[in-house]
Each structure stands twice: as C-alpha cells, then as structure tokens.
Interface confidence: medium
C-alpha cells in the first residue's frame, strides 16, 4: 500500500508580510494528480477556501485583492487526488502591517557607534503595546520580539547590543503589536541606519541561540545583551 500523499508547499506572493489594502496571492503547490485544493485558516471554519487546480494541475491560486485584518493569520493547504487528501502543508503566517500607527526607532547614545562599544535601539509607540519587533533589512532571520510579561502595556522596548561589531551595521525598522494577534503589526517605523566604525576584523559575536547553518554573516539574528531586558519585556527569537 502506498504511503501518505506528500504534503503540498504553501507560499505567498509578493510575500507573507503585507501592508493594509495591498493585494496578495497565496499559492499551494501539490502534485500533477491533484483534483482540488483546499486552504484552511486557523480559527476559521474549514475549509476557508477551495480552488480547482491551474494547469498543469500541480498548483492552485487563492487571491486576496485587498489585505485587511480578517485575512491575517495562519494558513495550511491540502490537495485531493484520486486516492484521497494529502497531508497538510507547513503553515504560512500571513501578517498585516498598518494596523496601528508607526513607532519611532532611535539609537542611544547615537546611530554612529564604534566597534566594541554598546548601543541600544529604542522602539517607542504612541499607544501602549505589549509586543515590539526589531527588523534588520536583508537578514534571513530578521525578527527579534520583545513581549511584555503578563500583557503589560508598554510604550517602548529596548534592544541593547554589546559589543557592537560590523555585523550589527545596517538598516533597522521596528513594529509594535498587541499580543492578542501577532499577525497584526503597526506601520513600520522610519528606517534607522546603524553605522559601525572601526576595524573590519572585529571578532564575530557568538549568537545567544543557534541559527541555521545556511545563514551567512548578514543573516545572523541580532545579539542583544543579556537574557531578559530591563523593561519588563520578555525576549523571543523568531
């Protein structure tokens, strides 16, 4: 007897982080034997949507013409072949930005920092939030979460980096969010350019948690100091 049908692949174009009002297409790719594709959204009645396969039948398209809060969430897809339904795909997390006003990102004491010194990136929101995210452009593991204990409402999160090396240089943005839906983010902050001066032969900081071996130097997650920040926010790696 044949084993279970292989799970399909699920992805979003142009990406899984979409601004409010923009269009997004969710693709589910199975096999040439697929007769039907089904998309399920977590905490929504199943199926969330069904589509016939596009020729040559190995994938289906689920279109969202205008992104809103209702579409943000966690999705899985399946396909049906003559022998039954496939295993579920790995989940796709569709995140909407623009749910809240943009925070402000600043560097203390300065965005110009000498290698080996310390800098703190400060993300401030005008409304109290319980989750803050710091994103570095062009990083494979860009997200660093700070989530407050017990849902405390904070107006800022501190992302300390020490010692700073050339790896930390680059462009950062931050987002704020409420814990009740981490699929809804604020508008992004204006970008902050962190410029690290000093020797290019600085020793690489060792990550506080292991990262994918496929990650290159620019793909390392941020390395903040310490395990628990002072602000009552708990750190989560993504």
């Amino acid at each position: 007897q044949a084993g279970p049908l292989p799970k399909p692949t699920l992805w979003a174009e142009p990406g899984s982080v979409i601004s409010w009002g923009n269009s997004v297409t969710i693709w589910c790719q199975g096999t040439l034997e697929a007769r039907e594709y089904r998309l399920d959204k977590e905490e929504s009645p199943a199926p969330w949507d069904r589509q016939n396969p596009l020729e040559p039948k190995n994938k289906a398209r689920f279109s969202i013409p205008s992104m809103t809060e209702d579409y943000a969430g966690r999705y899985r897809c399946y396909y049906r072949s003559p022998v039954g339904w496939s295993q579920p795909s790995d989940p796709l997390e569709l995140v909407m930005t623009g749910a809240y006003s943009k925070p402000t990102l600043s560097a203390l004491p300065s965005p110009l920092v000498t290698s080996g010194k310390s800098v703190t990136l400060l993300c401030q929101s005008r409304s109290p939030m319980d989750t803050f995210l710091l994103i570095k452009e062009r990083a494979a593991h860009p997200l660093l979460h700070l989530r407050s204990e017990h849902g405390a409402q904070q107006h800022q999160a501190e992302f300390p980096m020490s010692p700073v090396t050339s790896v930390h240089g680059g462009t950062y943005r931050c987002f704020s969010s409420h814990g009740f839906s981490h699929y809804l983010l604020s508008h992004p902050s204006d970008p902050l350019e962190l410029i690290v001066s000093g020797s290019l032969e600085d020793p690489r900081p060792s990550p506080t948690r292991s990262v994918s071996t496929a990650a290159g130097p620019e793909d390392q997650p941020l390395m903040p100091t310490g395990s628990v920040p002072h602000s009552g926010l708990r750190r989560h790696w993504e």
């Epitope: 809240y100 006003s101 402000t104 203390l108 400060l122 401030q124 929101s125 005008r126 409304s127 109290p128 407050s148 405390a152 409402q153 904070q154 107006h155 800022q156 501190e158 920040p229 002072h230 602000s231 009552g232």
Partner: antibody, heavy 121, light 107 residues
Framework: QVQLKESGPGLVQASETLSLTCTVS????????VNWVRQPSGKGPEWLGR???????VYNLTLESRLSISGDTSKNQVFLKMNRLRTDDTGTYYC???????????????WGQGTLVTVSS | ETVMTQSPTSLSASIGERVTLNCKAS??????VDWYQQTPGQSPKLLIY???NRHTGVPDRFTGSGFGSGFTLTISNVEPEDLGVYYC?????????FGPGTKLELK
C-alpha cells in the same frame, strides 16, 4: 494659542458620579492626545486616563472600573466621568495636551488651570 | 505599576547655586520621562520631555539626563522663580506615574 479649560461641579456627594468637561481651543482633537490628571491638595499629581481620537482610550487600571473618558471632536470637548465617588477623590482635576502630533514624548505639555472638586460625605 | 522615587524630598539652595534632582524608576522606562515644575496655586509646567529635551521657552539652565531607570534634572544657576516642587513622570508603561516630588526652597 493652545488653551484647555476644565468645567464641572465644585462639590459632589460621596457615592455619586462626577462629570467634568475639558473644552479646548487653538488645536484640533483629531490631531492631539488629551489626558486627565488629578492632584489632591498637597500631594503629587495622578494620571487618570487619556483620550486620543484615532487610537482610543487608555485608563489608569486602578481607577478603570470607575472611569469613563470620551470626546466630541466637533465641539472640541473631552469628558471625564467618575462614578462611586469617595472623599479621597477630592482634588484639583486637570486636562492636558501632548507636545506634538507624533505623541511619543512630552504628553503633558499644556495644562488647563484645573477645577477643584470636593467630595463630601 | 512603575513606581517613581525622587530624591531629595526637599532641598534649600542659594541664588546662583547648582542643584541636582534625582528620579528613579522601579523598572526601565527608556527615555520616557518628563520633568515638571509646580509653583503654589499654579498648574504643573513642563520643563523637560523625553529625558533630555527642553520644552519651548524653558531656560537653558535646566538640563535633563538619564536612560532606563535613573534620571536627573540639573539647575545650573538657581533663580528666585525656580522655587517650587519638581515632579518626574514616567510614561514608559501604563499606568503613567509621577514621582512624589522634590521641593526646592531658598536658603
């Protein structure tokens, strides 16, 4: 010129409800955040809550069950209601405005002159 | 809630003297601290916002500094009109809380 003016009854009985109005001029409530702050005589100020047209209301959790803040942007007014009054609610009640529309720092940059509320038993 | 403590409770200064007022937060509040001056019968007046920025019209003898949980307000040359009570305020987390105040008196 930025102006805030509080109005309401000077004397309220314990267990009753206090209703105060903050009437603003020189700026729009759709652009700025307005906070309510009170100060018992001889003591430090205490933040009560805030009204922000596009970002909702935030309350001091210790008073949240007794507080309600609302606004009428067309009349340039923000309202505070506090029920189940106690004698220790006596003090001067102020409304304040933040420094700029970004609303990140300097939240109590402009203050009204305050209105004295006495809660009698 | 974040508790703000101020020291000293009161201090006496001579005209022209330099004084430093301290404010400590029970947890980090970033730079979300303002300083206010209140004179008898008046509403509090914003001096410093965001830890270190002087509000419009505030003389440059007032300087604020600090980050995280420790903050200071320095008055470099005390003038007679500086007398009153100084409060720090944190708005890093809800509820926003004031310190108990430092009373500045004339020697």
């Amino acid at each position: 010129q930025v102006q805030l003016k509080e109005s309401g009854p000077g004397l309220v009985q314990a267990s009753e409800t206090l209703s105060l109005t903050c009437t603003v001029s020189g700026f729009s409530l759709t652009s700025y955040c307005v906070n309510w702050v009170r100060q018992p005589s001889g003591k430090g100020p205490e933040w009560l809550g805030r009204f922000w047209y596009d970002e909702g209301k935030v309350y001091n959790l210790t008073l949240e069950s007794r507080l309600s803040i609302s606004g009428d942007t067309s009349k340039n007014q923000v309202f505070l209601k506090m029920n189940r009054l106690r004698t220790d609610d006596t003090g001067t009640y102020y409304c304040t405005r933040d420094r700029d529309t970004l609303g990140i720092t300097g939240w109590f940059a402009y203050w009204g002159q305050g209105t004295l509320v006495t809660v009698s038993s | 809630e974040t508790v703000m403590t101020q020291s000293p409770t009161s201090l006496s200064a001579s005209i022209g003297e330099r004084v430093t007022l301290n404010c400590k937060a029970s947890q980090s509040v970033g730079i979300n601290v303002d300083w206010y001056q209140q004179t008898p019968g008046q509403s509090p007046k914003l001096l410093i916002y965001g830890s270190a920025n002087r509000h419009t019209g505030v003389p440059d003898r007032f300087t604020g500094s600090g980050f995280g949980s420790g903050f200071t307000l320095t008055i470099s040359n005390v003038e007679p009109e500086d007398l009153g009570v100084y409060y720090c305020l944190q708005y890093g987390s809800v509820p926003y809380t004031f310190g108990p105040g430092t009373k500045l008196e004339l020697k």
